[in-house]
Interface confidence: medium
């Protein structure tokens, strides 16, 4: 496996589809199955997922999909005869099959010249048949996730094995192991490999101990290691933070609930472009930081950090990473300042109630149409709306 692309080679967004994130192998998923390793095959096109064409579905594609999803191989690769539309049968374990759907003319096909995901390509509008859907049940119902880290790309490492989610012990857990996790999840590369208690402890079995990845493995279960041992408890659950995880902070204000908006993404702190910083984005950030709601969006100062992140929220999201976002690595925010926010929980809001004639207040004009006053001449007040 090649090393993940360094940050300056990636321009991505939450909505892009033509660009595959580091670690992503095939833009496919399985739906309506008994687990993440069985079901109807769907292919990502533009911003939507479309069912894959059943007529062009074969054992090589089935094998490649199962491998790409970290589900082992397809146990049996023969294609079942199309079922009758009235009563589609449940998929046989380990079989590829097609399910009826009358609307799939012009559907995308997954064409593979071998059973490896690198040998596959997605061909749009390839299907010219009776609209059968491709289905597969893979051999290994294995899956991986990061939990309790505030997003899909950070948290406690959990594996699904034998139908149960369980932890990985942090003995010998290092950045190479975390790299494999991040890449497998399509979360870029590992920024941190964390020992136990950085995230909440797990509850289920401990599936792995003494994990020792080279960093080149496609799946965590391909790494050398031992089954979970009795002496490894949940206080030793391994964790990871990947480059695609976003975390936020406010700097330069009176406290953690006021200041310049900074996002940690791909290993560095970035400023956020204020050209798309509206009440809904500010509201989501304040709430996600536990700082109440947004009260002010002061006009920012010039970017002190690399400013490349844009967000667009409807105001109902739990975090900014759930909003539509765009990270532009080739340009700093054009004609933009660094976004700032004052949240309702900031102590500056409660301490700075202006009396009718404020004491020791200096009013300073910074630019036309905007004035800011400095209480006790503290530089933190140099923020403009």
């Amino acid at each position: 496996h090649p090393s993940p692309a360094p940050p300056d080679q990636l321009n991505t967004s939450s909505a892009e589809s033509e660009l595959w994130e580091p670690g992503e192998r095939l833009p496919v998923r399985l739906t309506n199955g008994s687990s993440s390793c069985s079901g109807t095959v769907e292919v990502r096109l533009e911003a939507s997922w479309e069912p894959a064409c059943g007529a062009l579905w074969d054992s090589r594609a089935a094998e490649a999909v199962c491998r790409a999803l970290g589900c082992g191989g397809a146990e049996a690769a023969s294609q079942l005869a199309p079922p009758t539309p009235e009563l589609p049968p449940p998929p046989a374990a380990g079989n590829t099959s097609v399910a009826a759907n009358a609307t799939l003319a012009g559907a995308p096909a997954l064409l593979c010249s071998g059973a490896e995901w690198r040998l596959c390509e997605v061909v749009e509008h390839a299907c010219r048949s009776d609209g059968r859907r491709a289905r597969v049940t893979c051999a290994e119902n294995r899956a991986l996730r990061l939990v309790d880290g505030g997003g899909a790309c950070a948290g406690r490492v959990e594996m699904l094995e034998h139908g149960e989610w369980g932890s990985v012990c942090d003995d010998t857990w290092d950045l190479e192991d975390a790299h494999v996790v991040c890449r497998q999840l399509g979360c870029g590369w590992a920024v941190q490999a964390l020992p136990g208690l950085h995230f909440t402890p797990g509850r289920g079995p401990i599936h792995r101990d003494q994990v020792n990845c080279s960093g080149a493995e496609a799946y965590l279960w391909d790494c050398p290691g031992l089954p979970g041992q009795h002496y490894c408890g949940h206080k030793e659950d391994a964790g990871a933070v990947c480059s695609e995880h976003q975390s936020w902070r406010l700097t330069g204000g009176a406290d953690r609930c006021e200041g310049q908006v900074e996002v940690h993404f791909r290993g560095v702190w970035n400023t956020v472009c204020d050209s798309e910083w509206y009440p809904s984005e500010a509201k989501v950030l304040c709430q996600s930081l536990g700082c109440g709601t947004a009260v002010e969006r002061p006009k920012g100062l010039p970017h002190s950090l690399s400013g490349r992140m844009y967000y667009s929220c409807n105001g109902e999201e739990l975090t900014l990473s759930n909003c539509s976002w765009r990270f532009n690595n080739s340009n700093l925010c054009s004609q933009s300042l660094a976004a700032r926010v004052l949240c309702s929980a900031s102590r500056s809001l409660h301490n700075l109630s202006t009396p009718e004639v404020p004491a020791s207040v200096q009013t300073v004009t910074i630019e036309s149409s905007v004035t800011v006053k400095i209480e006790n001449k503290e530089s933190r007040e140099l923020m403009l709306l």
């Epitope: 002010e296 969006r297 403009l384």
Partner: antibody
Framework: EVQLVESGGGLVKPGGSLKLSCAAS????????MSWVRQAPGKRLEWVAT????????YYPDSVKGRFTISRDNVKNTLYLQMSSLRSEDTAMYYC????????????WGQGTLVTVSS | DIQMTQSPSSLSASVGDRVTITCKAS??????LTWYQQKPGKAPKTLIY???SLADGVPSRFSGSGSGQDYSLTISSLESDDTATYYC?????????LGSGTKLEIK
Amino acid sequence: EVQLVESGGGLVKPGGSLKLSCAASGFKFSRYAMSWVRQAPGKRLEWVATISSGGSYIYYPDSVKGRFTISRDNVKNTLYLQMSSLRSEDTAMYYCARRDYDLDYFDSWGQGTLVTVSS
Amino acid sequence: DIQMTQSPSSLSASVGDRVTITCKASRDIRSYLTWYQQKPGKAPKTLIYYATSLADGVPSRFSGSGSGQDYSLTISSLESDDTATYYCLQHGESPFTLGSGTKLEIK
């Protein structure tokens, strides 16, 4: 019920000063940013000044900068506009307006107080 | 500053007519737009906020639409009580800016 009542308007000579007040009731005054908006006779509405809920952020358009000062007293639930070096073009009805907490628009207005600058 | 271009500046229509007033922002304001109604000698009254949301107590004949730079206020069936001046306000970016107003008269 939200109520905003302006006072302090009147006749003043050019170059003179005047202080407007806006008494707020029916809501938690200290939670809301407040603004003054004016309207000259027969003319469009014009934003004059805004002060944030805690008073730490203050904004003016160029037309009044250096002459007008907005302030607030969150204990007395009152908004003020100190106007000096008044000009004839400052003649207008002055409204105080409350700014919505989430969406930032002016959601409640007072009935206004008339300021006439004339010799 | 964001400029708001409102049109028409005045219009005359009959009771029962459908009337539309438009506002164009100099750049995308992401639906942070409010429509106000002002009657002579009275304070402005909020009709529509966030481009499309009807304010409390406002009759359903008023509606707002639009996104990006272009927005409109529609009165589906004009009533005599609708004689007033209508203003748009963008509140996505400070300084907030207002349209020049549309004076609506009943024929």
